[in-house]
Amino acid sequence: MVPPPENVRMNSVNFKNILQWESPAFAKGNLTFTAQYLSYRIFQDKCMNTTLTECDFSSLSKYGDHTLRVRAEFADEHSDWVNITFCPVDDTIIGPPGMQVEVLADSLHMRFLAPKIENEYETWTMKNVYNSWTYNVQYWKNGTDEKFQITPQYDFEVLRNLEPWTTYCVQVRGFLPDRNKAGEWSEPVCEQTTHDETVPS
C-alpha cells in the first residue's frame, strides 16, 4: 500500500498558486506524484509523475472554488487522493506593495506600487482585482516603539512637518476594507529628514 502525500496545502501569494506537500516515508523506493484539478466535472492532470513535492496552479481562474488533489505513486501502485479546496480570490495572500520614498527637507514623499500578479500583464495588479484596494502606511521615528498609521487616499502620500535631521522608517501594506483583509507589510524603508523649510525671520 502506497501512503498518501502529507501536509498538503496551497501556498498562494498574489495568485502564484503553488500546491505543496511532503513525501511520506516509503521503504520500497522513491515516490512520484500526480496533481490534478477539477474542470467541468472532470479531473485534469497538472503535474504528472513528478518527483517534486509541489505543483504550480497559477493558471487557475481567480474566481470560484477549485478542487485540487494529489496522490503518491510507486510502479503501478498509488495512494488514495488527498483533496483540498481553494478559492484564489479569497485565499491568496496579498504580498507586500512596492514603495518609493524621497526626502524633501522635513517631508517624506512616498509612492506605492500595487503587487504584480502571476500570469498577468505587467499593468494588471492586485489593485485591478480588488475594487476596494487601499493602502495602510505605518511610520515611526527610528529607535522608538511608537508607530503611527495612516490610510492614504491615493497611490502616494506625503508626511510633512517631521523633525529635521531625524531618521523615520516607513512601511506599507495592501488592505481590503470590504473583506477586512490585510496584506503583508513591505520591508521598512528608513530615511533621514534634512532641515525644515521654515525661513528664519
Partner: nanobody, 124 residues
Framework: EVQLVESGGGLVQPGGSLRLSCAAS????????IGWFRQAPGKGLEGVSC????????HYAESVKGRFTISRDNSKNTLYLQMNSLRAEDTAVYYC?????????????????WGQGTQVTVSS
Amino acid sequence: EVQLVESGGGLVQPGGSLRLSCAASGNSLDYPTIGWFRQAPGKGLEGVSCISASDASTHYAESVKGRFTISRDNSKNTLYLQMNSLRAEDTAVYYCAASLHGLGCKSEADYDYWGQGTQVTVSS
C-alpha cells in the same frame, strides 16, 4: 447564451494595419473585463490585450505594446482592436472574450464567453 462575433480579419502585408471588431449578438458587451486573445499555428492561446470596465484601463502583452490599441464603443456594443505595424509573427486566429467576474485580464481561465475567432495573416 451570449455569442461573441469577431470580424475584420484578413490578409495584410507586413507594416500594414487592420481593425478587428467584436460584437455580442443580441446583447450588450457590458462585462467587467473584455479582451483579445490569439492563437498562432501550432501554438497555445496567448493574451493580447484587455480593457476593464471599472476604470476603462487598458492592458497589453509586451509583444504588441505600442502597436495595438484596444477600445470599446458602448453605444455600438462593440469592442475593437486596432493593429498597426503588423508583423509576420502576428499571424494568428484572434478571439474576443468576456469575463463575468473581471478579476483577470491575461489568463484564459478568467474568461467565460468566447467568440469563434477571425483569421489574421501577415504576409508579403
